[in-house]
Amino acid sequence: LIQERRSHEVNPAAHLTGANSSLTGSGGPLLWETQLGLAFLRGLSYHDGALVVTKAGYYYIYSKVQLGGVGCPLGLASTITHGLYKRTPRYPEELELLVSQQSPCGRATSSSRVWWDSSFLGGVVHLEAGEEVVVRVLDERLVRLRDGTRSYFGAFMV
Amino acid sequence: LIQERRSHEVNPAAHLTGANSSLTGSGGPLLWETQLGLAFLRGLSYHDGALVVTKAGYYYIYSKVQLGGVGCPLGLASTITHGLYKRTPRYPEELELLVSQQSPCGRATSSSRVWWDSSFLGGVVHLEAGEEVVVRVLDERLVRLRDGTRSYFGAFMV
Amino acid sequence: LIQERRSHEVNPAAHLTGANSSLTGSGGPLLWETQLGLAFLRGLSYHDGALVVTKAGYYYIYSKVQLGGVGCPLGLASTITHGLYKRTPRYPEELELLVSQQSPCGRATSSSRVWWDSSFLGGVVHLEAGEEVVVRVLDERLVRLRDGTRSYFGAFMV
């Protein structure tokens, strides 16, 4: 008999959490906590904000970001883009996988200057060994990261 | 040969649905339908709003709540918090797992005071046997339940 | 020893992406790309917008749609409904599985008539062989498709 996975071949999974160091301001992807609290890596590795695939296959990848602000100093037209992107050695540029655009400033009202919004992405993609997935948010300064439960990034093989 | 799961060891999974009894107004977590319609439990149990883990492992847990209202009464908080929380015998207080904050009242307009919003949470967490996961919404008065398709709570082992 | 899945019995999974042809305007469900780019079918089939189950079991099904507009013309409903629905040979009408209602037009303001919003649905449902799942959005004119990363539909067995 042949089985798909033996017990010592655990199903790859990871959940990474937001931290104070997540926002670099460098134009790069968000960075993540990989070990403390709720964060873990099992059969996947991490490098400079990226989940790195060690075993090829189909993965459900997901990310949530907590957006927030006080009023809309950038203007109400401001659009926030939250996306999951693939980096592959076979191609020089990042490839969009799953993307959302939101206009959260419409949530600020005269009776409530402080606004909160949340963006969730999740979907199945095929990833080869060595390929990487990163999260980007534009404008990242509107992402709340502090406590790890509101902004996060993860994956598991399906 | 050793395999990870034998056919009689089904992969734990559950999907619980909103019902008229879900909102208690008692300050406790939301309650859920476990058997009727789309609701089911497979390898997980249920107790007073909580999914109870019987087999330790990594689980993708998720919840969606349908929010809605007419305008924004002053008595209601301008921020809605929707979260998944863990209860463990090893710690007296609930632990935040996945949380979202939203300001849905900004969706009410001059031409339409009725507003609808939705909050989705999902992520992988490690759960031990006997640990419980619950859903809380503050302010729960804004949760719209209707038929079990708009507000729900589920999990499966990954 | 008996194992749940042998290596040649791959775990059913699919991810379908939005395309220019997705919006029919016919009152039917959204249509999807099944092969190009990020789209794939593995152990599931496709027919006229529907994912068709070939192997009975519990599936995590999901969909995201990107909503957007310029202001809110009177002809458009102020509420957008995004849902996943089941078609079964045993019943003449579609059955609601997972549904969200949103009022995205509240995001348009006098100084910024362009708005973006996103709706994500995901949950576990039991599906029999031959049953189908489709995505519907009312009003579909507000769905923004672009490149397949912003609106999509998928499933995998859990």
Partner: antibody, heavy 121, light 107 residues
Framework: QVQLQESGPGLVKPSGTLSLTCAVS?????????WNWVRQPPGKGLEWIGE???????NYNPSLKSRVTMSVDKAKNQFSLKLNSVTAADTAVYYC??????????????WGQGTTVTVSS | AIQLTQSPSSLSASVGDRVTITCRAS??????LAWFQQKPGKPPKLLIF???DLESGVSSRFSGSGSGTDFTLTISSLQPGDFATYYC?????????FGQGTRLEIK
């Protein structure tokens, strides 16, 4: 480290216009902040006058709205306040302050030292 | 406009004392409340934001709590430099408003 410095005449005649400028140093005015004006009459509490963003969006205290104008000069990295039709009741220490408007950190964290404006003939 | 009422208006205490100042909002403001310290001739200094978050560089002797309409600033062990006037401020809705202040004096 961002610093703010108010400047402007210390004496304004009744019915005249109070004009103040706040110079921003150590950082750009073109960031996700609100640039505020707050005043404090002698021996009294704090009163918010209004705010302006780098993109020129303004919000004013309704009690002063008809008399207030705020603007931003991105080239000079400064913002300004104009309050017309002043009376003795407008005599106060005027502060400029930065309010962070990002997700993780709120609050008026940087203040100027304040400038005293007296309305008198 | 949202009114903030601080109590007490003035307070006498000694070095080492634990002091609590309360701020009540006329309507709910979630956690959009800040606390400031002001000394004579100086601008206000931000101590606490979002009701309970300690501003960088501020002593951990200061703590804030509350949500909705009732908020508290606590100084765990008074130091000589803490004698000043304290203001709460709501930034939840326009117009931004301040409490009337609490003057903390040496006993």
């Amino acid at each position: 480290q961002v610093q703010l410095q108010e400047s402007g005449p210390g004496l304004v005649k009744p019915s005249g216009t109070l004009s103040l400028t706040c110079a921003v140093s150590g950082g750009s005015i073109s960031s996700i902040n609100w640039w505020n004006w707050v005043r404090q009459p002698p021996g009294k509490g704090l009163e918010w006058i209004g705010e302006v963003s780098h993109s020129g969006i303004t919000n004013y205290n309704p009690s002063l709205k008809s008399r207030v104008t705020m603007s931003v000069d991105k080239a000079k990295n400064q913002f300004s306040l104009k309050l017309n039709s002043v009376t003795a009741a407008d005599t106060a220490v005027y502060y400029c302050a930065r309010e962070r408007a990002v997700a993780d950190y709120h609050g008026m964290d940087v203040w100027g030292q304040g400038t005293t404006v007296t309305v008198s003939s | 406009a949202i009114q903030l009422t601080q109590s007490p208006s003035s307070l006498s205490a000694s070095v080492g004392d634990r002091v609590t100042i309360t701020c009540r909002a006329s309507q709910g403001i979630s956690s959009a409340l800040a606390w400031f310290q002001q000394k004579p001739g100086k601008p206000p200094k931000l101590l606490i934001f979002d009701a309970s978050d300690l501003e960088s560089g501020v002593s951990s002797r200061f703590s804030g709590s509350g949500s909705g309409t009732d908020f508290t600033l606590t100084i765990s062990s008074l130091q000589p430099g803490d004698f000043a006037t304290y203001y709460c401020q709501q930034f939840n809705s326009y117009p931004i408003t301040f409490g009337q202040g609490t003057r903390l004096e040496i006993k």
